[in-house]
């Protein structure tokens, strides 16, 4: 591109015409202030293409850069653009006149910014002040640009002298901004509500000073639109937030939420949803399976735990055998109810130590001005076995017998063995299982007893050896679900003298 | 300051030429921009063609292959040879001259086309 006169800067006078030619090898054209003024295109005979940009009248106004540009860069090897700056002395013109958003002047970091005030003659003297201040701060001045530096956040007005009088510019405002990658959180008061409470969304963006809110919602779909608020934590730096506040929700709001923040200064933005589910009533479900019959061991501490949803909050109540329970002084019964989420609750029923008389009939109730939900099982309390008796007799039959007796929760198995060999056995031989009734050796008589105020069943059972021709240990073996206990007797013949 | 004077118009047929001249007064010592403009009733001052310092001859499209821009550097004078001219070259001519960042116009001369 070739530029006449060449430049970089010319001065010329008010009310005077100038021409600007550029001329190059494909189209060209004239820019002023991102636009195209009024030129005329010519070409010479070499294929030589000019643009001819002829100023007149001339006044302070015409004072600033020019630029010359092929009309069409697409397609040439550089996007060349040739600048002239020219300046019209005008009297009657003081500081050129900014566009508004040329007067605040934001700063995402510390950085040289230019506060751009500039005169028609650069032969004045510019000086910048603080809005507020005389003094003038040392910061180099350049007539085409203005004044650069690094600023704080203050506002600042340039003044310079015309003639005999002092003139000042526009105030300009420089901000520094808090700007960061865009981090959203969304959350409701609730995001169960019933028809006609309110629904009460939150939005909240941290580490930007300015950002666009924009919330999608079921309503605005159908055109009816909600103004959603705007404020900044005051106790929390760069947090603000945009409360959206449907009151007396209908069942159309049920729905997906979303706030989608814009920062415009690098061009970020996330968006976060949440989902608000509108009930035409509260409700109260059980959640999970809990069986009729429960158990517990004796003297173990524990837990029974029933899960379920429900909005609004519900009461719980827990009862035994139909009467009330509560927690107790002595530290034997603890309730609980927990929200686990926002509509989910675990209620905990711990018996400490459990006893006896804890068996029995349980009942859960969770309810509400809206629905209720009841649960129920047995709580059956398991006890060890314990062998209480073993005991041998030779009644005058002529036979041997031994008796053992024992009692557990749930129903103890008895298990008769016997050892022959008492050196060998049990550690060499295993034990030989009696009362099969294949064997007519022994005979087994088993009798089952329900004890109800203990709670627990007992086992008596006899075992009629036929005839023992030498010393027998004999082994009873009580188990239920939670244990075993076993004692031994060892039977000699009649004939011996002696037993052990 | 340089004074230029610009002849040569009048009354011309459709097809027919015309020869403008532009004498300028005083002493030029380089000359940045030459030109002729013109403006039609009711219409802005357009350039017809022009010759930058060291350049070849510009014209618009509307004038190319009719008109010729020349110069005698020994009598201060350009001329602007106007040939099968139309009725819408009708206008007031000017020539103009810069040099450095002054410039000076012609008073214009009228060209009319018409039969």
């Known amino acids: 591109l070739v530029v006449t006169p060449p430049g970089p800067e010319l001065v010329l006078n008010v009310s005077s015409t100038f021409v600007l030619t550029c001329s190059g090898s494909a189209p060209v054209v004239w820019e002023r202030m991102s636009q195209e003024p009024p030129q005329e295109m010519a070409k010479a005979q070499d294929g030589t293409f000019s643009s001819v940009l002829t100023l007149t009248n001339l006044t302070g106004l015409d004072t600033g850069e020019y630029f010359c540009t092929h009309n069409d860069s697409r397609g040439l090897e550089t996007d060349e653009r040739k600048r002239l700056y020219i300046f019209v002395p005008d009297p009657t013109v003081g500081f050129l006149p900014n566009d508004a958003e040329e007067l605040f002047i934001f700063l995402t970091e510390i950085t040289e910014i230019t506060i751009p005030c500039r005169v028609t003659d650069p032969q004045l003297v510019v000086t910048l002040h603080e809005k507020k201040g005389d003094v003038a701060l040392p910061v180099p001045y350049d007539h085409q640009r203005g004044f650069s530096g690094i600023f704080e956040d203050r506002s600042y007005i340039c003044k310079t002298t015309i003639g005999d009088r002092e003139v000042d510019s526009d105030a300009y405002y420089v901000y520094r901004l808090q700007v960061s990658s865009i981090n959203v959180s969304v959350n409701a008061v609730q995001t169960v509500v019933r028809q006609g409470e309110n629904i009460t969304l939150m939005c909240i963006v941290i580490g930007n000073e300015v950002v666009n809110f924009e919330w999608t919602y079921p309503r605005k779909e159908s055109g009816r639109l909600v103004e959603p608020v705007t404020d900044f934590l005051l106790d929390m730096p760069y947090h603000i937030r945009s409360i959206l506040h449907i009151p007396s929700a209908e069942l159309e709001d049920s729905g997906t939420y979303t706030c989608n923040v814009t920062e415009s200064v690098n061009d970020h933005q996330d968006e976060k949803a949440i989902n608000i589910t509108v009930v035409e009533s509260g409700y109260v479900r059980l959640l999970g399976e809990v069986g009729t019959l429960q158990f517990a061991e004796l003297h173990r501490s524990r837990t029974l735990q029933v899960v379920f949803e429900a909005y609004p909050p519900p009461t719980v109540l827990w009862f035994k055998d139909n009467r009330t329970l509560g927690d107790s002084s002595a530290g034997e019964i603890a309730l609980s109810t927990r929200n686990v989420s926002e509509t989910r609750y675990v209620s905990e029923l711990t018996l400490v130590r459990v006893k006896v008389a804890e068996a029995g009939h349980y009942t859960m109730r969770a309810f509400h001005e809206d629905a209720e939900v009841q649960l129920s099982f047995q709580l059956q309390i398991n006890v060890p076995v314990r062998v209480l008796e073993l005991s041998e007799s030779h009644p005058d039959s002529g036979e041997q017998t031994v008796r053992c007796r024992g009692r557990g929760m749930p129903q103890p198995n008895i298990i008769w063995s016997a050892c022959r060999d008492l050196k060998r056995c049990p550690r060499e031989l295993p034990p030989t299982l009696l009362g099969n009734s294949s064997e007519e050796e022994s005979q087994l008589e088993t009798n089952v007893t329900y004890w109800e105020e203990e709670q627990e069943f007992e086992v008596v059972s006899t075992l009629r050896l036929q005839h023992v021709d030498r010393p027998l240990s004999v082994r009873c073996t009580l188990r239920n679900a939670v244990g075993q206990d076993t004692q031994e007797v060892i039977v000699v013949p009649h004939s011996l003298p002696f037993k052990v | 300051e340089v004074q230029l004077v610009e002849s040569g118009g009048g009354l011309v047929q459709p097809g027919g030429s015309l020869r403008l001249s532009c004498a300028a007064s005083g002493s030029i010592v380089r000359v940045d921009f030459m030109g002729w403009y013109r403006q039609a009733p009711g219409k802005q001052r357009e350039v017809v063609t022009f010759?930058?310092?060291?350049?070849?001859?510009n014209y618009v499209d509307s004038v190319t292959g009719r008109f010729t821009i020349s110069r005698d550097n020994a009598k201060n004078t350009m001329y602007l040879q106007m040939n099968s001219l139309k009725p819408e070259d009708t206008a007031v001519y000017y020539c103009?001259?810069?040099?450095?960042?002054?410039?000076?116009w012609g008073q214009g001369t009228q060209v009319t086309v018409s039969s």
């Open positions: 010759i930058t310092s060291g350049g070849s001859p």
């Open positions: 103009y001259i810069q040099s450095g960042t002054a410039g000076s």
